[in-house]
C-alpha cells in the first residue's frame, strides 16, 4: 500500500481467483483514543472500533472511502483504491491500446517544433467517474522539470456501438534547449482512476522522435505563360522552430488526379517552390518533415489546380 | 579551422546532410525493440553529445563557432572509431553494400574537413567495448546508430546555418 495523495491510498493486489489479498491497517487521524467507530462509504454499518482498523483487501468491495467517527462526527477519511496485477502485469483496463507505432501504446505524444512543448493524448470508452493526473520530467534518476497543464476532454467519437473519448494534456519543458542533442528522454506518467480502480501509464521519448510539423502554409499556384506547367510555392508553418536556416524542413509534393486510383508521382525537395504539371480537376499537395532527422511527416496541405 | 579560421561551410553542409541520409539507411526506424528499455546503458552514455553549453545554437555560432566545431569533430572521430570496431565487423554479418561502410568513410571525410593536415585538437578516449555475443553486439550497433542519427542531425543544422549565414 502507498499514498497517492493526502488521504488516498493505493493497494496493490495480485489478481487471481482465491488470492489472499493484502492486509491493510488504517489509523484514524485524531488525538482521540476511545469511542471511535469505522464505516465504509455511505453504508452505516460499523466495521470495527478503535483507533486502528485492520482489513483484508481482496476485491473492489473492500475498497472505497473508510471513515472513522466519534459521536456521530467524522474524524478522518482514507480512500482505498485498487491496483490490479494479473500474471505479473499491471492492469490496463481504463485506456485503449492505440497500437501505433507499436502494441501496448496507450499514450501518444507529438511536438510541433523543438521548443520543448508537446501534447500527449489517450483514448478510453469510459465516460463517467474518471479522473486523470499527469506528471512529467526530463530523465528519471535526476529529473529536470517539465510543467503540464490540465487534462482536457479533447474529442468524442462514435466507434460502432461505442463512444470513444480522447483526453489530452499539454506540457512544456522548463529549461528547453532546442539546438542541443537530447541525452535523456522525457518521461510522462499518467495516473488514471476509474471509480475505485487505479492504473498508471507511462511513456518515454525524445522530443526529436515525436516531432510532427504542422502542414506548410500559404500554398499558391501561378500558371506559367504558354505552358501546362504551374509554379507552386508554399511557406514554413508558423509553429516551426526558427531560424529556418538552422531548423530546416524538407518537403514532399504530389499532384493527385480526381480519381484516387490515378498514379501520383511524389517529388522530394528542400526548396519552398516547384514547377509541376497541374491538370484541371487535380489538386496539388505538400507535406513537411525535419530535413535532418526522420521523424513524422506533417499532414498534407492541399490546393485545387484549377 | 583550428586557430579560428572558417570551415568550408558549404562542403561541410553537403557532407553532413549525406551523413544524415546514410545514418537512417543504416538503421531505419523499426518497431522491433525499444532500445532504451534494454541494458548496456554505459556504452552509449559515453558517446559525445552536443549539449546546451557547446555553442552549437544559432547565437553561439555567431559569437564563436570554434567551440561547436571542436565538439562536432570530437564526436565524428568517436563515431568513426566505433563504426570501424568489431561491434560492426563481427556477427551479425553486414554485407559489403551496407550503408555503415559509407557512413564510416563519410565520418572520416567530414572530420578531416574540420581539421586539415597538421592541426591536432585533443580528442577524448574512445571506449573499446567488445561484446562477445551477437545479441549484445547487435543491440549496441542499433544504439550507436540511433545516437549517431541524433548527433549528425545537430551537426547538419550547424553546417546548414553556417553555410547560409556565416560563409564569407
Amino acid at each position: 500500500i502507498w499514498e497517492l495523495k493526502k488521504d488516498v491510498y493505493v493497494v496493490e493486489l495480485d489478481w487471481y481467483p482465491d488470492a489472499p489479498g493484502e492486509m491493510v491497517v488504517l489509523t484514524c487521524d485524531t488525538p482521540e483514543e476511545d469511542g471511535i467507530t469505522w464505516t465504509l462509504d455511505q453504508s452505516g454499518e460499523v466495521l470495527g472500533s478503535g483507533k486502528t482498523l485492520t482489513i483484508q483487501v481482496k476485491e473492489f468491495g473492500d475498497a472505497g472511502q473508510y471513515t472513522c467517527h466519534k459521536g456521530g462526527e467524522a474524524l478522518s477519511h482514507s480512500l482505498l483504491l485498487l491496483h490490479k496485477k494479473e500474471d505479473g502485469i499491471w492492469s490496463t483496463d481504463v485506456l485503449k491500446d492505440q497500437k501505433e507505432p507499436k502494441n501496448k501504446t496507450f499514450l501518444r505524444c507529438e511536438a510541433k517544433n523543438y521548443s520543448g512543448r508537446f501534447t500527449c493524448w489517450w483514448l478510453t470508452t469510459i465516460s463517467t467517474d474518471l479522473t486523470f493526473s499527469v506528471k512529467s520530467s526530463r530523465g528519471s534518476s535526476n529529473p529536470q522539470g517539465v510543467t503540464c497543464g490540465a487534462v482536457t476532454l479533447s474529442a468524442e467519437r462514435v466507434r460502432g456501438d461505442n463512444k470513444e473519448y480522447e483526453y489530452s494534456v499539454e506540457c512544456q519543458e522548463d529549461s528547453a534547449c532546442p539546438a542541443a542533442e537530447e541525452r535523456l528522454p522525457i518521461e510522462v506518467m499518467v495516473d488514471a482512476i476509474h471509480k475505485l480502480k487505479y492504473e498508471n501509464y507511462t511513456s518515454s521519448f525524445f522530443i526529436r522522435d515525436i516531432i510532427k510539423p504542422d502542414p506548410p502554409k500559404n500554398l499558391q499556384l501561378k500558371p506559367l505563360k504558354n505552358s501546362r506547367q504551374v509554379e507552386v510555392s508554399w511557406e514554413y508553418p508558423d509553429t516551426w522552430s526558427t531560424p529556418h536556416s538552422y531548423f530546416s524542413l524538407t518537403f514532399c509534393i504530389q499532384v493527385q488526379g480526381k480519381s484516387k486510383r490515378e498514379k501520383k508521382d511524389r517529388i522530394f525537395t528542400d526548396k519552398t517552390s516547384a514547377t509541376v504539371i497541374c491538370r484541371k480537376n487535380a489538386s496539388f499537395s505538400v507535406q513537411a518533415q525535419d530535413r535532418y532527422y526522420s521523424s513524422s511527416w506533417s499532414e498534407w496541405a492541399s490546393v485545387p489546380c484549377s | 579551422v583550428p586557430g579560428g579560421s572558417s570551415p568550408a561551410w558549404a562542403q561541410c553542409q553537403q557532407l553532413s546532410q549525406k551523413l544524415c541520409t546514410l545514418a537512417w539507411s543504416a538503421h531505419p526506424l523499426v518497431g522491433h525493440m525499444d532500445l532504451r528499455e534494454e541494458g548496456d546503458e554505459e556504452t552509449t552514455n559515453d558517446v559525445p553529445h552536443i549539449q546546451c553549453g557547446d555553442g552549437c545554437d544559432p547565437q553561439g555560432l555567431r559569437d564563436n563557432s570554434q567551440f561547436c566545431l571542436q565538439r562536432i569533430r570530437q564526436g565524428l572521430i568517436f563515431y568513426e572509431k566505433l563504426l570501424g570496431s568489431d561491434i560492426f565487423t563481427g556477427e551479425p554479418s553486414l554485407l559489403p553494400d551496407s550503408p555503415v561502410g559509407q557512413l564510416h568513410a563519410s565520418l572520416l571525410g567530414l572530420s578531416q574537413l574540420l581539421q586539415p593536415e597538421g592541426h591536432h585538437w585533443e580528442t577524448q578516449q574512445i571506449p573499446s567495448p567488445s561484446p562477445s555475443q551477437p545479441w549484445q553486439r547487435l543491440l549496441l550497433r542499433f544504439k550507436i546508430l540511433r545516437s549517431l542519427q541524433a548527433f549528425v542531425a545537430v551537426a547538419a543544422r550547424v553546417f546548414a546555418h553556417g553555410a547560409a549565414t556565416l560563409s564569407p
Epitope: - | S25, E91, P92, L95, P96, D97, L138
Partner: antibody, heavy 120, light 107 residues
Framework: QVQLVQSGAEVKKPGSSVKVSCKAS????????IHWMRQAPGQGLEWIGY????????KYNENFKGKVTITADKSTSTAYMELSSLRSEDTAVYYC?????????????WGQGTLVTVSS | DIQMTQSPSSLSASVGDRVTITCKAS??????VAWYQQKPGKVPKLLIY???TRHTGVPSRFSGSGSRTDFTLTISSLQPEDVADYFC?????????FGSGTKLEIK
C-alpha cells in the same frame, strides 16, 4: 520498381555446366549485392553466395566452392551464376535475390526462379 | 554452419485457428532472423525480419517473436490464403542458412 528477371529452364547432362542469368532493373545495379539461392524439389532453401557488382567481389558458401562461379556484367546490369560438374543432386530451382538496403541479408526482391534439371 | 531446426515439418489447421511455427538456431543469432512464405509454384515472399518486424504490406495476423536461439512465427487467425510453405532464415553468420520449411494446410 525493382525487378529481377532470370533466364529460362535448362536441362543438362551430368558432368556438364550451366550458366543462369539474372537481369536487374529499377535500382542502381552497383549499389547492392545480388545473392543466389537454390531449392531442390520438395526441399528448403540453400544460400549459395553473392556478388557485389561495385567491386566484382563474390562470396561463396564453402559447400559450393569450386562448384559455383558468380559474376556480374555492369554494362547490362546482369548477374550470372555458373554451375560446373553437374550431378543429379544439382537439380533444383535457382533463385537470385537482393537484400534490404540496410546491409543485412533478408531478401525483399526475388527473381522468378530458373529450374535446372540434371539428367542423363 | 548455423543449423536452423524448424518444426513442425507440416501442420493442418482450421480457418480462424492460431498457428505457431518454431525455429531453433544452433547458436546465438541475436534477432537476425527472417521468415518467408512460399505458395506452391511461387517465389518466397518476405514476411518478417529482425525476428519481429513485419515487412510492408504483410497482414497484421502474422507476427514474429524470439531472440538468440528460439524464434516463433504466429498466424493469429488462419485464413484460406495462408496455405503455403514457411521458412525461417538466419542472416547473422555466413553461410546464411534456412530452416527446412513447414507445410501449412487447411483442415
Amino acid at each position: 520498381q525493382v525487378q529481377l528477371v532470370q533466364s529460362g529452364a535448362e536441362v543438362k547432362k551430368p558432368g556438364s555446366s550451366v550458366k543462369v542469368s539474372c537481369k536487374a532493373s529499377g535500382y542502381t545495379f552497383t549499389d547492392q549485392t545480388i545473392h543466389w539461392m537454390r531449392q531442390a524439389p520438395g526441399q528448403g532453401l540453400e544460400w549459395i553466395g553473392y556478388i557485389y557488382p561495385r567491386d566484382d567481389s563474390p562470396k561463396y558458401n564453402e559447400n559450393f566452392k569450386g562448384k559455383v562461379t558468380i559474376t556480374a556484367d555492369k554494362s547490362t546490369s546482369t548477374a550470372y551464376m555458373e554451375l560446373s560438374s553437374l550431378r543429379s543432386e544439382d537439380t533444383a530451382v535457382y533463385y537470385c535475390a537482393i537484400p534490404d538496403r540496410s546491409g543485412y541479408a533478408w531478401f525483399i526482391y526475388w527473381g522468378q526462379g530458373t529450374l535446372v534439371t540434371v539428367s542423363s | 554452419d548455423i543449423q536452423m531446426t524448424q518444426s513442425p515439418s507440416s501442420l493442418s489447421a482450421s480457418v480462424g485457428d492460431r498457428v505457431t511455427i518454431t525455429c531453433k538456431a544452433s547458436r546465438d543469432v541475436a534477432i537476425a532472423v527472417a521468415w518467408y512464405q512460399q505458395k506452391p509454384g511461387k517465389v518466397p515472399k518476405l514476411l518478417i525480419y529482425w525476428a519481429s518486424t513485419r515487412h510492408t504490406g504483410v497482414p497484421s495476423r502474422f507476427s514474429g517473436s524470439g531472440s538468440r536461439t528460439d524464434f516463433t512465427l504466429t498466424i493469429s487467425s488462419l485464413q484460406p490464403e495462408d496455405v503455403a510453405d514457411y521458412f525461417c532464415h538466419q542472416y547473422s553468420s555466413y553461410p546464411f542458412t534456412f530452416g527446412s520449411g513447414t507445410k501449412l494446410e487447411i483442415k
